[in-house]
Structures are given as structure tokens and as C-alpha cells.
């Protein structure tokens, strides 16, 4: 249902926010070595991708009846 979708999305957004903060806090306490910088890049990219994915979940696909018709009206008239 839409309510369940919204609830799941809200949960995921909250989880991601918490996870991102935890990861960033952990990384900021690590010495700025090359390895730490690389790890921070991985975490940032990973959560950015997850955020992008969950933003698409909000957009509902158009209903099948609301897509392009199999036979376009102008073609049907011409035939």
C-alpha cells in the first residue's frame, strides 16, 4: 500500500541518515592518511548511490493503461 511504501521509505531514509553520520564520525576520527581518504570516498559514494536509488522509489510507474496505445489514433484513422 502507499502507506507501507511511505513508511518503508521513511525508515530507510532515517537509517541511511544515521548510518551516514556514524560512518562520517568514525572516518573523521581516523588520521587523514591516504587509506582513510580513500575509505571516506567509498562510503560517501556508496551512500550517495543508495540515496539516488531510494529517491527513485518514490516515483510510481505510470499505469499500463496510461501508456502509449498499441495503435495510435492517427494510424487507425488512416487505415
Amino acid at each position: 500500500s502507499e502507506a507501507e511504501d511511505a513508511s518503508l521509505l521513511s525508515f530507510m531514509q532515517g537509517y541511511m541518515k544515521h548510518a551516514t553520520k556514524t560512518a562520517k564520525d568514525a572516518l573523521s576520527s581516523v588520521q587523514e592518511s591516504q587509506v582513510a581518504q580513500q575509505a571516506r570516498g567509498w562510503v560517501t559514494d556508496g551512500f550517495s548511490s543508495l540515496k539516488d536509488y531510494w529517491s527513485t522509489v518514490k516515483d510510481k510507474f505510470s499505469e499500463f493503461w496510461d501508456l502509449d496505445p498499441e495503435v495510435r489514433p492517427t494510424s487507425a484513422v488512416a487505415a
Epitope: 510507474f61 499505469e63 502509449d68 496505445p69 495510435r72
Partner: antibody, heavy 114, light 112 residues
């Protein structure tokens, strides 16, 4: 030839209502889903609503949900848009469009202003 | 909502030359049925929009073959080869894959 002719637009005060009609001809109206699309003054196009061939399914943009109702009468080859509690931001030219965006009517102007 | 970013905002072309319009989307437009519901329209002054291209690359009925649609993923292009005076107007991209269906902001084509 295929024709879509909108009517029912006009000037209305905020909070008022209007009912738009679209008379279809030149194709088998009852076998096509239909849509309303509007073009606001700054020229941007916005999908407003869609309706299934038999009227059993509908879809709306968030900003008009609960205020606008799309319907159709296949016996009369006519599409409708009942617009209630109109707001200034609903001011636009409203087009009747066949699903797939293949064919558009000439549009009817709706102006919401006090 | 899926954002459609059109560029350029306007262009001026000499008759016979080519013109290209880009439309970038904020997410992919492949529907669950496997098709991509992406369109191009032309709106001439004082007229309704008319469909040029549907499902990325299919020309609508009566549209000259100088209009070509292409693209995939989030990048789509309309190319007009051998531009004619009657091609002047505002070009819009749009999608019908998700709700709400959205349109680009338009590209005004002027013929020099």
C-alpha cells in the same frame, strides 16, 4: 479527421469552480485513455490528469488531487475535468490530449483571479 | 518528480544547417514494461504542441525524416538536419514513464 475541441474555460474567482469539456471526433474515443495537460503563463507544460478507457482508472498530479476530477462519457465522445476550489496557480491553457501525447486539442483558457 | 533539463534555452539557425537539442533527465526512464516513454514536441506560435517523436526515436505520423530522436539512460537528443523556416517554434521534451509526467522547459528555435 481527428479533432479534440475543448470548452468551458473562463475567468473565475479563487475558490470557484469550472467544468471543462473536450468533444472528440474522428477516432474511436472509447478505446483510448485520455489526459488533460495545462500550459501555465510562463509557458511551462504540466500533466494534470489521466483517465482509463472505461473511466475505471484515474491519475492526478499532487497539486490538484482532491480538487480536480477527471471523467468521461464514451456515449457522447466527451472528456471532462471538474475543477473545484480553484487557485491562482491553476491559471493556464488546458489541453485535452490522447494518451501517448499523439494528438492535442486547441486548448481552453482558465483564469483564476479576484 | 523526474526533472527534465533542456539545453540550449534558445538557438538561431540558418536554413539548411543542422540543429541539436539536448534533454537530460534526473533518472532513467525505462518503464517496468521495458519501454522508454520519452517524447519531443514542437509548439509553433499560437498553436498547440504537436508530437514529433515518441518512445525516444519513433517519428509521429506525418513528421519529416529530417527530425531524428536518439538517446538512452538519462541523455536524449533531438536533431533537425536541413532546418526549414517552418521548423521555427519552441521544442519540448517530456516523459510519461512515472507519475507525474513531466516536460522540459523548452528550447526556442529561431530561423535566421
Amino acid at each position: 479527421q481527428l479533432q479534440l475541441v475543448e470548452s468551458g474555460g473562463g475567468l473565475v474567482q479563487p475558490g470557484g469552480s469550472l467544468r471543462l469539456s473536450c468533444a472528440a471526433s474522428g477516432f474511436t474515443f472509447g478505446t483510448y485513455s485520455m489526459r488533460w495537460v495545462r500550459q501555465v503563463p510562463r509557458k511551462a507544460l504540466e500533466w494534470v490528469s489521466s483517465i482509463h478507457t472505461d473511466g475505471g482508472g484515474t491519475a492526478y498530479r499532487d497539486s490538484v488531487k482532491g480538487r480536480f476530477t477527471i471523467s468521461r462519457d464514451n456515449a457522447k465522445n466527451t472528456l471532462y475535468l471538474q475543477m473545484n476550489n480553484l487557485k491562482p496557480e491553476d491559471t493556464a491553457i488546458y489541453y485535452c490530449v490522447i494518451a501517448g501525447y499523439s494528438d492535442w486539442g486547441q486548448g481552453t483558457q482558465v483564469t483564476v483571479s479576484s | 518528480a523526474t526533472m527534465l533539463t533542456q539545453s540550449p534555452g534558445s538557438l538561431s539557425v540558418v536554413p539548411g544547417e543542422s540543429a541539436s537539442i539536448s534533454c537530460k533527465t534526473s533518472q532513467g526512464l525505462v518503464h517496468s514494461d521495458g519501454k522508454t516513454y520519452f517524447y519531443w514536441f514542437l509548439q509553433k506560435p499560437g498553436q498547440s504542441p504537436q508530437q514529433l517523436i515518441y518512445q525516444v526515436s519513433n517519428r509521429a505520423s506525418g513528421v519529416p525524416d529530417r527530425f531524428t530522436g536518439s538517446g538512452s539512460g538519462t541523455d536524449f537528443t533531438l536533431k533537425i538536419s536541413g532546418v526549414k523556416a517552418e521548423d521555427a517554434g519552441v521544442y519540448y521534451c517530456a516523459h510519461g514513464t512515472y507519475y507525474p509526467h513531466t516536460f522540459g522547459s523548452g528550447t526556442r528555435l529561431e530561423i535566421k
